[in-house]
């Protein structure tokens, strides 16, 4: 089944997809679908990669990540109720029924009203020993360590706090990048 | 060291073919992205696409699909482009550029440009 | 295709200068942005790939930073041989687009 994510209307967000290159600089085709994930290909594509490039997307979705070093985690820009629904990732690699497909659920909430600006989550907390930050300022690194032997307890740990959208928010606006292995 | 030497100045009548050649040497040829960019007289720098050597893959700017082919010989390490159905706004000087995974696919050495006259 | 925005078009300069030129995504780019450099009758040549990573060789004085789709190249003391049209390029998607260019000149 599906790994749910959610995000308020007028955020962006955030929908995670992971993959290693076989070795540096070979990237596969990755598509991303409205929809889950069909036999071959991807229904309803927003975006697709090739060997080296983005060479297809609509308006409002892109890779913030380093796509080329395998993360291919999909941005959706300003959500709407409408951007609800499943979401299929489809790592191609080469070879019959070799594809990688993750079906990831998209839950858009109304946006909240708050009369306040409250303290954002301190998601190095939520992370120790795993981010690589990456500031505002001009190429200034950060480094509060490395993951050395992550297992699936961990992985799974972390996919249930990446589905709280407003941490993967404050995630992606820092710039920080989850490195797992 | 690594070298991209390009064929010379081409005069062509509105309508013809152009074939331009690109030899590299000093690094292995297959395993780099050969891009091809012109820049028109006075103006800014355009990609027409590349070829990966290795696979024979092209990508081509949509702009140009139908009238540009990119072809490359590995036993003499050279890069073809070629632009059919010339016009006179295709005067410009077109580039050989190599690009690897190393820069993200930037163009980090390029050939010394080819002069290509469009004129009736 | 993606269009990148480069201003401003001419620098007047002097020897020792700092000079900072932007260039603007018409979407995000994630850090896939490239600097060239021109100098008349000369190739380009790289010197900033994905955003803040200098080349192999290229002096210090030269920078890039940004994300998403603001984009800033600079070089801290400009010296006589910076004189050159310089061009931003996003290398994230195809067609690969190129900034206009910056041309700097003498003051």
């Known amino acids: 089944s599906e790994v749910e994510y959610r995000a308020e209307v007028g955020q962006n967000a955030y929908l995670p997809c992971f993959y290693t290159p076989a070795a540096p600089g070979n990237l596969v085709p990755v598509c991303w679908g409205k929809g889950a994930c069909p036999v071959f290909e991807c229904g309803n594509v927003v975006l697709r990669t090739d060997e080296r490039d983005v060479n297809y997307w609509t308006s409002r979705y892109w890779l913030n990540g380093d796509f080329r070093k395998g993360d291919v985690s999909l941005t959706i820009e300003n959500v709407t109720l409408a951007d609800s629904g499943i979401y299929c990732c489809r790592i191609q690699i080469p070879g019959i029924m070799n594809d990688e497909k993750f079906n990831l659920k998209l839950v858009i909430k109304p946006a909240k009203v708050t009369p306040a600006p409250t303290r954002q989550r301190d998601f190095t907390a939520a992370f120790p020993r795993m981010l690589t930050t990456r500031g505002h300022g001009p190429a200034e690194t950060q480094t509060l360590g490395s993951l050395p032997d992550i297992n699936l307890t961990q992985i799974s740990t972390l996919a249930n706090e990446l589905r709280d959208s407003r941490l993967a928010n404050d995630l992606r606006d820092s710039g920080a990048t989850i490195r797992i292995g | 060291q690594v070298q991209l030497v390009q064929s010379g100045a081409e005069v062509k009548k509105p309508g013809a073919s152009v074939k331009v050649s690109c030899k590299a040497s000093g690094y292995t040829f297959t395993d780099y992205y050969m891009d091809w960019v012109r820049q028109a007289p006075g103006q800014g720098l355009e990609w027409l696409g590349y070829i990966y050597p290795n696979k024979g893959g092209t990508s081509y700017n949509q702009k140009f699909k139908g009238r540009v082919t990119m072809t490359t010989d590995k036993s003499t390490s050279t890069a073809y482009m070629e632009l059919r159905s010339l016009r006179s706004d295709d005067t410009a000087v077109y580039y050989c550029a190599r690009s690897g995974y190393g820069n993200y696919y930037t163009m980090d050495y390029w050939g010394q440009g080819t002069t290509v006259t469009v004129s009736s | 295709s993606i269009v990148m925005t480069q201003t401003p078009k001419f620098m007047p300069v002097s020897a020792g200068d700092r000079v900072t030129m932007t260039c603007k995504a018409s979407q995000s780019v994630g850090n896939n942005v490239a600097w060239y450099q021109q100098k008349p009758g000369q190739s380009p040549k790289l010197l900033i790939y994905y955003a803040s990573n200098r080349y192999t060789g290229v002096p210090d004085r030269f920078t890039g930073s940004g994300s998403g789709t603001d984009f800033t190249f600079t070089i801290s003391s400009v010296q006589v041989e910076d004189l050159a049209v310089y061009f931003c390029?996003?290398?994230?998607?195809?067609?690969?687009?190129f900034g206009t260019g910056t041309k700097l000149e003498i003051k």
């Open positions: 390029q996003q290398h994230y998607s195809s067609p690969s687009t």
